[in-house]
């Protein structure tokens, strides 16, 4: 327990002290006092450096003194023989004696008292930054006006922290600027702007004068800027050493000004303003930015438009442009969106044609459609080449997005007809010579395939049976063979409106307009044995002249049998109509004069007994196309005749081309379009 005074006596004092003793006393006076220790009696064996016996005075780690020998007072008015004054409140006294004493020594008597110390003057380190005030047992620090005493109760500083600046523009200066700034202070200023604005600090070199750095380059007084995880500074010296324009890239900035106890200068002054946060001009491939600017800032909106052939895809839909906003964090919204090549997808397949699997279906890719040659050709031109266009469609230079149409090649037999074996009234033929030949089984007759959906025949063939069964692709019409051939199912029969329907068809004498069309339910697949015949053109080139040759084919009556099982054919010349008129009707059902002959009829035959006959009706009279020798067209249809083996009459198809085209157009299906 600290005491204000006390007495310390050597062992046995005032008797002689014993040998081999060590005793210590810990002196403690109250905090804020020093110790005055004085000896009134000293009688200790003398030795060099007091090595044998001694009294030692220790303050902390320091030996204040070591005493031995005899002392007497120099002052007759004072009993003090030795004294010590320490400015601390603790002291240790240690007495030691060795194993022998040559004489009898009485030791020592000492006293201590607590004494006041002047903390303001007694120490090398001044305890107060500004004013020091001593009192008995302690001291206190005080500050000049406008300064305040820090929590350590020793240091004074100015109250320069806590200011928060939220305006978009402002000015901040060190305390007292341009007068010297306060020492020993830490000033903190906060700038807090709306998100989306960055703080930009501007200084002038001459507006900055802060105590310079020490020899190691460390600022004694310093100005530091902290923006998030970025720091600018510390700065010090005469004239601002940093950039005069600091873009912080942050809406929050802390300014910290730290000063020490010495070397005050005029300080600093700065301006700040809020700049809208910039967003980088990003390189977005395959697109253009609108508006195009050198610099984009917070709240700027750009329209990013993909170049032709590129799009932004979301799920199954795409867009060619989108909007992007420069956001408060300095980044673009929608930066994920990328313009990627348009994908036209797998091209559609076409009837009777194909498209090879494309290597790519992306913008700019090329595909080629082809038709199943030699039976189909591309009707609508364009060459079949399509490229993947910017709108995501496969596009042809001629047709645009319209798909090519593969239509049957007409009038080209796979094998030309040759009259090999001379038989009465004609030759055996193969269906490949007349792939357009259609067989009607009730009545036994013929027809001509003119496209995938239509069969041309004589009106008298279908007037009695509006749902005829037809076959294509077979040379033989034996039942077993027909089972393997292609049967055609009619959807509707269209008889020419000029064909006169009779109660008793057997007595007919007027075969004018003997033409009909049969619309099929399903399209016919073309091949070597099934292929249409062409229709005549409307130009005068297709007007027949006497002597022009044509081919007829069918399974009608021959010289030997009522019906042929295998296809027969003959080549006949066109004859003047009068030649047909001159032939006597074989089994007249009426007066010979009653038979009607019109310009809608062609007369042909009369040579070597070659003629069509019963059962050949409706079959084509095929003539070589005057403009394309590789093709045949249906110049006529087997209609009637005065007598088999002479001349026959054929419906003049050229006169009905308009009716045929109109009927087909009006009764086409979407599948055909």
């Amino acid at each position: 327990e600290p005491t204000m005074y006390g007495e310390i006596l050597s062992p046995n004092y005032p008797q002689a002290y014993p040998s081999e003793v060590e005793k210590s006393w810990d002196i403690e006076v109250p905090e804020g006092y020093g110790i005055h220790l004085y000896f009134t009696h000293l009688d200790i064996e003398l030795s060099e450096n007091c090595a044998y016996d001694s009294v030692q005075i220790i303050s902390g780690d320091t030996e204040e003194g070591r005493l031995c020998g005899q002392r007497s007072s120099n002052n007759p008015h004072s009993p003090i023989v030795e004294e010590f004054q320490v400015p601390y409140n603790k002291l240790q006294v240690i007495f030691k004696s060795d194993f022998s004493n040559e004489e009898r020594f009485t030791g020592f008597a000492a006293y201590y008292v607590a004494t006041d110390i002047n903390e303001c003057t007694d120490f090398v380190d001044v305890p107060c930054s500004h004013f020091c005030n001593n009192f008995i047992g302690g001291y206190f620090c005080s500050c000049p006006p406008e300064y305040f005493l820090h929590d350590d109760m020793k240091n004074c500083g100015v109250n320069c922290s806590g200011d928060v600046f939220t305006a978009l523009i402002g000015e901040i200066a060190s305390p007292n600027y341009p007068k010297p700034y306060p020492e020993n202070s830490r000033c903190e200023y906060q700038i807090r702007l709306e998100k989306g604005f960055q703080v930009v600090v501007t200084l002038r070199r001459e507006d900055f004068d802060v105590e310079a750095a020490d020899s190691a380059g460390n600022c004694l007084d310093s100005l530091v800027f902290v923006a998030g995880d970025r720091q600018f500074g510390p700065y010090c010296g005469h004239g601002f050493p940093g950039p005069l324009n600091i873009e912080t890239k942050s809406n929050a900035l802390d300014i910290i000004f730290q000063t020490d106890l010495t070397g005050q200068k005029k300080g600093w002054k700065l301006r700040y303003h809020g700049d809208p946060m910039p967003c980088p001009k990003e390189d977005t491939p395959n697109s253009v930015w609108e508006p195009a600017k050198a610099k984009y800032v917070f709240r700027d909106v750009v329209q990013i438009t993909c170049l032709d052939g590129f799009e932004v895809v979301e799920g199954r839909v795409g867009a060619t442009s989108f909007y992007s906003t420069c956001q408060s964090n300095g980044k673009w919204s929608n930066s994920k969106l990328k313009c990627q090549p348009v994908d036209c997808g797998i091209p559609e397949s076409i009837e009777n044609g194909k498209v090879e699997d494309p290597e790519s279906t992306l913008f700019g890719s090329v595909i080629r459609y082809t038709c199943e040659e030699p039976y189909y050709y591309m009707e609508n031109g364009g060459g079949g080449e399509y490229h993947c266009a910017g709108n995501g469609s496969w596009v042809n230079e001629v047709l645009g997005p319209e798909l090519p149409k593969c239509v049957p090649v007409c009038g080209v037999p796979r094998e030309p007809f040759e009259e090999k074996q001379r038989i009465i009234g004609g030759s055996d033929a193969d269906i490949k010579n007349f792939p357009w030949q259609v067989f009607f089984d009730n009545p036994w007759a013929g027809g001509a395939l003119i496209n995938e959906y239509w069969v041309l025949t004589a009106a008298h063939v279908v007037e009695g049976n509006r749902e005829p069964t037809m076959y294509v692709g077979s040379t033989s019409v034996q039942t077993s063979r027909l089972a393997k051939s292609k049967m055609l199912t009619p959807e509707h029969v269209f008889i020419h409106p000029g064909w006169k329907l009779l109660e008793v068809p057997e007595g007919r004498t007027n075969f004018d307009n003997d033409i009909a069309l049969v619309r099929l339910k399903d399209p016919v697949k073309m091949g070597p044995t099934v292929s249409p015949i062409c229709l005549p053109g409307t130009s005068s080139d297709y007007n027949l002249m006497d002597g022009d040759l044509g081919l007829i084919s069918g399974w009608g009556r021959t010289e030997k049998r009522d019906r042929a099982v295998r296809l027969k054919a003959a080549r006949l010349p066109v004859a003047p109509l009068r030649k047909c008129k001159e032939v006597k009707v074989e089994k007249p059902t009426a007066d010979a004069e009653a038979y009607v002959f019109t310009p809608n009829m062609i007369c042909a035959g009369g040579e070597k007994g070659m003629d069509s006959c019963k059962g050949d009706s409706g079959g084509a009279f095929a003539v070589q196309d005057p403009n394309d020798k590789t093709k045949f067209y249906a110049a006529g249809l087997v209609s009637w005749g005065p007598q088999c083996g002479t001349y026959g009459l054929y419906t003049r198809v050229k006169n009905y081309v308009d009716w045929i085209m109109k009927t087909m157009q009006e009764n086409s299906t979407p599948r055909e379009d």
Epitope: R299, V301, Q303, V312, V313, E314, G315, V317, A319, F322, Y323, T325, Q327, N329, K331, S333, N334, S335, K336, L337
Partner: antibody, heavy 116, light 107 residues
Amino acid sequence: QVQLVQSGAEVKKPGASVKVSCKASGFNIKEYYMHWVRQAPEQGLEWMGWIDPENADAIYAQKFQGRVTITADTSTNTAYMELSSLRSEDTAVYYCARSRLFFAYWGQGTLVTVSS
Amino acid sequence: DIQMTQSPKSLSASVGDRVTITCRASQDVRTALDWYQQKPGQSPKLLIYSASYRYSGVPSRFSGSGSGTDFTLTISSLQPEDFATYYCQQQYTTPYTFGQGTKLEIK
């Protein structure tokens, strides 16, 4: 197929926080933006903010700034929305939605009730 | 922030009617406007994006038009399943904002 499945309904006291999850399947959230939209009872839709899970960049509506935190865990393909300092007017159905060009897919919604 | 104002707030119509809902933006949003349909207890569903493009699977009776500040959603012939609340939303700039909604009820 694309699906966003949200966590179940929550009842919270005023001042508390709530964290709603949105688990995505059928796509990778890193390739899209994940938004949060709320709808108070008998009220309209209110956009709260979004996150780009690829880089964790988030943007919030000014109204919710400081109270909402949108995060994403790409390893579990899940987005989260945490709303703090709840008050009674935060009672609403909270939806997550996926976007690139538009909000094509939405979660089923999570009802958060704030009541003392 | 861009404000979106829908009109009318609610409307009654009959099956087969032609219905038009309008949406006005407080500033130009070009064509960055989407329309959503929401039925009670369900999440919103996208109908129209970029002002006029019908989203996949949306019936052709729904159409959108407009650009700048004035937009329209039209239902050409109302079907029973169309009675719901419709919202417009601008995606021109953040924060993305919705209209307050138009409730379509059976007359």
